[in-house]
């Protein structure tokens, strides 16, 4: 019967006793940077070409005996997971292997860098179809390795990497911390984070999604027909590399940004038990388990968005945090979050010709996060409209006044140290949903976009009594672009988007009391693109 991991990534409409995905990734080449491999294994023979590239350090220890089957173990298994005939994800994908890890599974940054350069040169000499590079390795943070990944990604290559098996923040490791790389954590058959001895899968904001990574059956280098179970984020990354190969084979023109958004969109949502992660990492870690799309075509009509968290600002008074979207993505809204509740809001600002989301810490605050909502919106023209603090008691308000521009997000930023504990709530005037409102001491920023067929609406959910969390979700067919809190009197810790739901967090109920002053309203801006929908109908 079908191994659990292949069943897990298969959408229900394709589920059967056997794994029969609609397309095998035959138009895509996957490069594997790992150990040597046993290329005559029946799973991968004829599918994996062993390149002449080898750059590995000497094995440690004088008593180390180089045994071929041990040297090949990791790479052979991963090659099988990606494209193996029997237990592979993308059964049609061809692969090329580069040896950058020695028989003990150790490599160097320089060896990996030279390997990436080898791929770049190969691509220039003989351009083929879409390329996926699988980096099932993790080492300490390396600016130079991340930069090399960025260069290759910007040349059109999709890089997929393991989050690392250190039960730690993936941002502390490379290439996992490179924003351009698709970073994959590992889950088990129960959709729980994988534990490996005393350690386990890495987590945090640098992880894009999770994938099966425990007890994964694949080719064993012991013999040409042998299979074995292995576990780790390498195996998880191999699943995503296989899924990416299949998506790219179905839609070869997909950009890295489009592919990443689709991987996120088609993932299983909210199935991971977040209690496994350290408390401060839960909100930052995506609750997503990779899956194949239910159909390899026809996803183009959707407006895809994802949430990008910044690094923590640090606790200094004037500290700021910046969240950025990928080059092909539009920043449609910006929010902020602070565990202490002491923050001075956020604003969208231009940086290097592109909008970024900047959050501001407040005096006495432990630091803030900036949260960007990054979307794929072709032919978009977006700008930020700002209203400075108002004189009037009605509060500050700003709307999209340009013809054809719609509101996609609201941000507010204030100079005073602590806003909201002693100010009366601001009520939005009825019949004026296409505007952002805020405290009179705050400057308000509206993200206004024009794109063919783009329409947006505001959806609110208010709770009169204090609640630690208030949510509002966009309905089917609409995508959450903006998430903010209507300024009330309770201490709002911040707002952020989780998939298609806007979450507003407040300080612990026990500290705010249960008066009407604790009212919190979550405001979601939900958008859709009629233009994209029509375009996809024409294509089908």
């Amino acid at each position: 019967s079908i191994p659990w991991n292949l069943e897990r990534i298969t959408p229900p409409r394709y589920r059967a006793d056997e794994y029969q995905p609609p397309d095998g990734g035959s138009l895509v080449e996957v490069y594997l940077l790992d150990t040597s491999i046993q290329s005559d294994h029946r799973e991968i023979e004829g599918r994996v070409m062993v390149t002449d590239f080898e750059n590995v350090p000497e094995e440690d220890g004088t008593r180390f005996h180089r045994q071929a089957s041990k040297c090949d173990s990791h790479g052979t298994h991963l090659a099988g997971v990606v494209s193996g005939r029997d237990a592979g994800v993308a059964k049609g994908a061809s692969m090329r292997s580069l040896r950058v890890l020695n028989c003990q599974g150790k490599g160097t940054v320089s060896g990996t860098l030279i390997g990436l350069e080898f791929i770049r040169k190969s691509q220039l000499v003989q351009p083929v179809g879409p390329l996926v590079v699988l980096l099932p390795l993790a080492g300490g943070y390396s600016r130079v390795l991340n930069a090399a990944c960025q260069r290759l990604a910007r040349a059109g290559v999709v890089l997929v990497t393991a989050a690392g098996n250190f039960r730690d923040d993936a941002c502390l490791y490379s290439p996992a911390s490179a924003p351009e790389v698709i970073t994959v954590g590992a889950t088990n058959a129960q959709d729980q984070p994988v534990t490996l001895g005393t350690l386990g899968t890495n987590f945090g904001r640098c992880v894009d999604l999770f994938a099966p990574g425990e007890d994964i059956i694949g080719a064993s280098s012991d013999c040409s027909t042998c299979f074995v179970s292995q576990s780790g984020t390498s195996q998880a990354a191999a699943h995503v590399a296989g899924i990416a190969a299949m998506m790219l084979s179905a839609e070869p023109e997909l950009t890295l940004a489009e592919l990443r958004q689709r991987l996120i969109h088609f993932s299983a949502k909210d199935v991971i038990n977040e209690a496994w992660f350290p408390e401060d990492q839960r909100v930052l870690t995506p609750n997503l388990v990779a899956a194949l799309p239910p159909s390899t075509h026809g996803a183009g009509w959707q407006l895809f968005c994802r949430t990008v968290w910044s690094a923590h600002s640090g606790p200094t008074r004037m500290a700021t945090a910046v969240a950025r979207c990928a080059p092909d993505e539009e920043l449609l809204s910006c929010s902020s979050f602070s565990r202490s509740g002491k923050r001075r809001g956020e604003r969208m600002e231009a940086q290097g010709g592109k909008l970024v989301c900047r959050a501001h810490n407040a005096f006495g605050g432990e630091g803030v996060y900036a949260i960007a909502r990054c979307c794929l919106l072709p032919q978009a023209n977006c700008s930020v409209h700002t209203a400075p603090p108002a004189e009037a008691s009605m509060g500050t308000r700003v709307h999209c006044h340009q013809q054809g521009h719609v509101l996609t997000g609201c941000s507010s930023h204030w100079e005073v140290e602590d806003l909201g504990t002693h100010k009366p709530p601001v009520l939005r005037p009825r019949g004026q949903p296409n505007q952002c409102v805020g405290h009179r001491e705050a400057s308000i920023h509206a993200s206004c976009c024009h794109a063919p067929g783009l329409e947006c609406k505001v959806k609110e959910h208010g709770i009169p009594a204090p609640q630690e969390q208030v949510t509002v979700a966009c309905e089917e067919g609409w995508t959450l672009t903006g998430c903010s809190a209507l300024p009330g009197t309770s201490h709002v810790l911040g707002a952020y988007a989780v998939d298609n739901t806007c979450v507003v967090r407040s300080r612990d109920v026990s500290t705010t009391g249960s008066t009407s002053e604790g009212a919190v309203t979550a405001v979601a801006i939900c958008c859709r693109s009629r233009h994209l929908a029509q375009a996809s109908q024409e294509l089908q």
Epitope: E18, Y19, Q20, G24, S69, S73, D86, S221, D222, T225
Partner: antibody
Framework: QVQLVQSGAEVKKPGESLKISCKGS????????ISWVRQMPGKGLEWMGI????????RYSPSFQGQVTISADKSISTAYLQWSSLKASDTAMYYC????????????WGQGTLVTVSS | DIVMTQSPDSLAVSLGERATINCRSS????????????LAWYQQKPGQPPKLLIY???TRESGVPDRFSGSGSGTDFTLTISSLQAEDVAVYYC?????????FGQGTKVEIK
């Protein structure tokens, strides 16, 4: 149910060509390997080769390499064993067998095709 | 190639008695990564295709009576029929499936004494 059905018995002359078939049903033919096994009269089992119908990848036993050709047509869930020039020593019962990947062994067998080569 | 050698070539056992067949491989078929022996046993009755009895050297295929058992590891293996029944008259083959070419033993014919 899962089964492999082989083509009927053949009587041929030396030097003639022949293609026998093995049709799978009740399972995803593309995803399972098919082996061919020879059994000469009164003798034991000899593995000839294997094919993966998904991509028609084949492996042959050195004893049969160049002597026979194994192929498959996944659109009709059928594997084939063929000879371009038969010899009297090819007289035997030929079995196809499904190979289950995780326990690479033969869990389902065809009923066999008897090939007789005689002048 | 891995050569499989069975003994004896033939065996006559009384009904209800134990039958033991040995099989030796020219090299080990035990692999450390999953601690499995890549060895199977098949039964072939006259005029029928072979039938899988045992895999991984000792795991009984579903539907196979529990009087059939397999044991051994590495290079030496045994198929035991604990209490021979009339329907067990057949030729039994061992097979290694760890590497290509897949090879069978020459067969052991079991008859009733």
């Amino acid at each position: 149910q899962v089964q492999l059905v082989q083509s009927g018995a053949e009587v041929k002359k030396p030097g003639e060509s022949l293609k026998i078939s093995c049709k799978g049903s009740g399972y995803s033919f593309t995803n399972y390997w098919i082996s061919w096994v020879r059994q000469m009269p009164g003798k034991g089992l000899e593995w000839m080769g294997i094919i993966y119908p998904g991509d028609s990848y084949t492996r042959y036993s050195p004893s049969f390499q160049g002597q026979v050709t194994i192929s498959a047509d996944k659109s009709i869930s059928t594997a084939y064993l063929q000879w371009s020039s038969l010899k009297a020593s090819d007289t035997a019962m030929y079995y196809c067998a499904r190979d289950y990947w995780y326990k690479p062994l033969f869990d389902i067998w065809g009923q066999g095709t008897l090939v007789t080569v005689s002048s | 190639d891995i050569v499989m050698t069975q003994s004896p070539d033939s065996l006559a056992v009384s009904l209800g008695e134990r039958a033991t067949i040995n099989c030796r491989s020219s090299q080990s078929v035990l692999y450390s990564s999953n601690n499995k022996n890549y060895l199977a046993w098949y039964q072939q009755k006259p005029g029928q295709p072979p039938k899988l009895l045992i895999y991984w050297a000792s795991t009984r295929e579903s539907g196979v009576p529990d009087r059939f058992s397999g044991s051994g590891s590495g290079t030496d293996f045994t198929l035991t029929i604990s209490s021979l029944q009339a329907e067990d008259v057949a030729v039994y083959y061992c097979q290694q499936y760890s590497s290509f070419p897949i090879t069978f033993g020459q067969g052991t014919k079991v008859e009733i004494k």
